[in-house]
């Protein structure tokens, strides 16, 4: 879903049961620690020397919804995610490095603690390099492992 096409779209939804109060996880993993802003996430990544994983998504996007369920239910993903600084965003930041090939959702971008965007860690779709679908969960797991191999910083 290209979010530049439909910004501010409303979600036609009615929950079938009362939900818990919304948290920063937004359903991507309630047991994980999520940061609130990009600035906070960058600071935490640098100071903790943990890579940052940023998930761009939209509530009203079916593919965001589908990926979210698989991500949240996959035990390996959730376990590995503990080693990251985590941020999920339902809006775009002003940092163009977070949309190297467009502002589509869902997309997942990794940032090294050296504050280098890992544009080299891509999914399988040539037209949307940072997009993942539920069938790509094994690839996402591999890419998370790649991101954990930190870039060497010059002394």
């Amino acid at each position: 879903k290209d979010i530049t096409v439909k910004s501010g779209a409303k979600k036609d939804t009615k929950d079938s049961a009362p939900k818990l109060p919304q948290t920063l996880s937004r359903g991507w993993g309630d047991q994980l620690i999520w940061t609130q802003t990009y600035e906070e996430a960058l600071y935490k990544s640098k100071t903790s020397n943990k890579p940052l994983m940023i998930i761009h998504h939209l509530d009203e996007c079916p593919h965001s919804q589908a990926l979210k369920k698989v991500f949240a239910e996959n035990k390996e993903i959730q376990k590995l995610a503990e080693q990251f600084v985590l941020l999920n965003l339902v809006y775009e930041t002003t940092d163009k490095h977070l949309s190297p090939d467009g502002q589509y959702v869902p997309r997942i971008i990794f940032v090294d603690p050296s504050l280098t965007v890992r544009a080299d860690i891509t999914g399988r779709y040539s037209n949307r390099l940072y997009a993942y679908e539920p069938s790509d969960i094994a690839l996402l797991l591999d890419n998370m492992k790649k991101a954990l191999k930190l870039l060497k910083t010059e002394l």
């Epitope: 879903k1 290209d2 096409v5 929950d15 079916p62 369920k69 679908e133 539920p134 069938s135």
Partner: antibody, heavy 120, light 107 residues
Framework: QVQLVQSGAEVKKPGASVKVSCKTS????????MNWVRQAPGQGLEWIGW????????NYNGKFKDRVTLTADKSTSTVYMELSSLRSEDTAVYFC?????????????WGQGTLVTVSS | DIQMTQSPSSLSASVGDRVTITCKAS??????LSWFQQKPGKAPKTLIY???RLVDGVPSRFSGSGSGQDFTLTISSLQPEDIATYYC?????????FGGGTKVEIK
């Protein structure tokens, strides 16, 4: 193998409600989206909404939002579609259709359909 | 809502003919398009998803192509059992929307 078995035909009066069931088997019920689609006599297909049985999350076509409720019962691996304030134009065959086996949104398997007739 | 325009609305072809049905979306839907076959009195059957991926068990004479706004379903060699109505569906955005259908008959 995957099976979606829907409840039998219903005849309802205008203003009434109808609840159609779709009993599933042959896959992990909680991890595939379930869609509902309808088809009026001699007409095309129309998407009503979907539900994720794992946690009950739903999304509805705005056309039906105020009248439709999708629910799931994990104990019986059954999803339900309830449509209220029925009118004659709701006369249609209602289908449940499971999403992809891996949690993808595409519609993979279909139930046999349930004819709902609304007539005074 | 995204509009899906399917053409032709009906066609008549001979057994063995190559048949092409097109679907045009009112906006870019990436590759999030499926094709279904429906025979009278039956539920639809899914043939293709993600524009070009063939569902297990569907004969290889069926194929899908396209991305963005323009999509095609091709039956490479029409068989008598292919007589049906064919529908496309976009699932890029809520609400999912179907094309109006193409009725395929044998000459």
């Amino acid at each position: 193998q995957v099976q979606l078995v829907q409840s039998g035909a219903e005849v309802k009066k205008p203003g009434a409600s109808v609840k159609v069931s779709c009993k599933t088997s042959g896959y992990v019920f909680s991890r595939s989206w379930m869609n509902w689609v309808r088809q009026a006599p001699g007409q095309g297909l129309e998407w009503i909404g979907w539900i994720y049985p794992g946690d009950g999350d739903t999304n509805y076509n705005g056309k039906f939002k105020d009248r439709v409720t999708l629910t799931a019962d994990k104990s019986t691996s059954t999803v339900y579609m309830e449509l209220s304030s029925l009118r004659s134009e709701d006369t249609a065959v209602y289908f449940c259709a499971r999403g992809g086996y891996d949690g993808s949104p595409w519609l993979s398997y279909w139930g046999q359909g349930t004819l709902v007739t609304v007539s005074s | 809502d995204i509009q899906m325009t399917q053409s032709p609305s009906s066609l008549s072809a001979s057994v063995g003919d190559r048949v092409t049905i097109t679907c045009k979306a009112s906006q870019d839907i990436n590759s999030y398009l499926s094709w279904f076959q429906q025979k009278p009195g039956k539920a639809p059957k899914t043939l293709i998803y993600r524009a070009n991926r063939l569902v297990d068990g569907v004969p290889s004479r069926f194929s899908g192509s396209g991305s963005g706004q323009d999509f095609t379903l091709t039956i490479s060699s029409l068989q008598p059992e292919d007589i049906a109505t064919y529908y496309c569906l976009q699932y890029d955005e809520f609400p999912f929307t179907f094309g109006g259908g193409t009725k395929v008959e044998i000459k």
